[in-house]
């Protein structure tokens, strides 16, 4: 495939990845497919300016990103470490709430209206925010 | 009512260490991130440190990296200030302030404590 | 490093003037930047943060404006409590730097 070097259309440029700001909500599994489907994957935050970008453009929304712990320990979809990366949790998360009646606990990871991050019931319809880097390889063959 | 009181400071020969607390009361210590800001005589404000709630994350300013650590201890509610490798420019007074949580100000400080490096 | 600088680094002012402070970031900090107040022998005061919002006790003649990197503290009618030194940071990106300050005094 051929490297992208610019950010499609109506995605935002920063530091060398591309952003899509969602102004629907879905469950998280559908947002991850959503992005998947575009070549890329829920926004993986891994310093403190993507934190304050991301921040800042998604405002006090609820809004998916790609961290889960749907099979254990938490997980960034992309493979970043989790354990030694940057970290953004509320005081008092991530708990794994069982109160909330939905069944099972909270798996899924979103960004809270104050910007810092709780988890949460994975079927609930938040917004998300997609995330490519820029210089990857895309999924698209070459124009000829 | 928020307070912040700082101490240990002091007068150290260059070279040597020295560590800063601060007690905090008035507030759940434990849900807050806090900073160490110094100021020099007659000089202006520079950022030292931050440390997040649960310690978590730290960074500090390229000035002190490697020399300072910050720490804390949320059963005690103290933040402190490892201070090595002392050298004349750290004098200064050390203030330590509460970070607000999202947007990362300063919303309440210490009174200070004065550190003297001097042979 | 992000460097924040302020203009001017003083200015002689009556009570009742209109009073700006600029200040420059050397790269885009969005709107994470904030204000404090100053007085000789006391801790830094909060007087606003992310660029407009006011904080809680802080009286209404102080407001900030600006994006990006240009920003800008306005003090509408300067009051005798004013005069002291104001500094902006910057925490869109650590270290969190400070301008160098502003001093505010009396013409």
């Known amino acids: 495939g051929s490297e992208r070097t610019c950010c499609p259309v109506n995605w935002v440029e920063h530091e060398r990845s591309c952003y899509w700001f969602s102004r629907s909500g879905k469950a998280w599994a559908d947002a991850d497919n959503y992005c998947r489907l575009e070549d890329a994957h829920l926004v993986v935050v891994t310093s403190w300016e993507e934190q304050k970008f991301v921040q800042h453009h998604i405002g006090p929304v609820n809004t998916w990103m790609g961290l889960h712990d749907q099979n254990g320990p938490w997980k960034w979809v992309d493979g970043t470490d989790y354990e030694t990366g940057f970290k953004n949790w509320r005081p008092e998360q991530p708990d794994d709430w069982y109160g909330h009646g939905l069944g099972g606990g909270e798996d899924c990871a979103h960004f809270t209206d104050d910007g810092r991050w709780n988890d949460d019931v994975c079927q609930r319809p938040y917004r998300w925010v997609c995330e490519t880097e820029l210089d990857k390889a895309s999924q698209e063959p070459p124009l000829l | 009512q928020v307070y912040l009181v700082e101490s240990g400071g002091g007068v150290v020969q260059p070279g040597r260490s020295l560590r800063l607390s601060c007690a905090a009361s008035?507030?759940?210590?434990?849900?807050?991130?806090m900073h160490w800001v110094r100021q020099a005589p007659g000089k202006g404000l520079e950022w030292v440190a931050v440390?997040?709630?649960?310690?978590?994350?730290?960074y500090s300013a390229d000035s002190v990296k490697g020399r300072f650590t910050i720490s804390r201890d949320n059963s005690k509610n103290t933040l402190d200030l490892q201070m090595n490798s002392l050298r004349a420019e750290d004098t200064a007074v050390y203030y330590c302030?509460?970070?607000?949580?999202?947007?990362?100000?300063?919303?309440?400080w210490g009174q200070g404590t004065l550190v003297t490096v001097s042979s | 490093d992000i460097q924040m600088t302020q203009s001017p680094s003083s200015l002689s002012a009556s009570v009742g003037d209109r009073v700006t402070i600029i200040c420059r970031a050397s790269?885009?900090?969005?709107?994470?930047l904030n204000w404090y107040q100053q007085k000789p022998g006391k801790a830094p005061k909060l007087l606003i943060y992310?660029?407009?919002s006011l904080q809680s006790g802080v009286p209404s003649r102080f407001s900030g404006s600006g994006s990006g990197t240009d920003f800008t503290l306005t003090i509408s009618s300067l009051q005798p409590e004013d005069f002291a030194t104001y500094y902006c940071?910057?925490?869109?990106?650590?270290?969190?730097?400070f301008g160098g300050g502003t001093k505010v005094e009396i013409k």
């Open positions: 940071q910057q925490t869109y990106s650590p270290p969190l730097t």
């Open positions: 302030a509460r970070d607000n949580g999202n947007w990362n100000y300063l919303d309440y």
């Open positions: 008035g507030f759940t210590f434990s849900s807050y991130g």
């Open positions: 992310a660029t407009s």
């Open positions: 790269q885009s900090i969005i709107s994470y």
């Open positions: 440390i997040w709630y649960d310690g978590s994350n730290k």
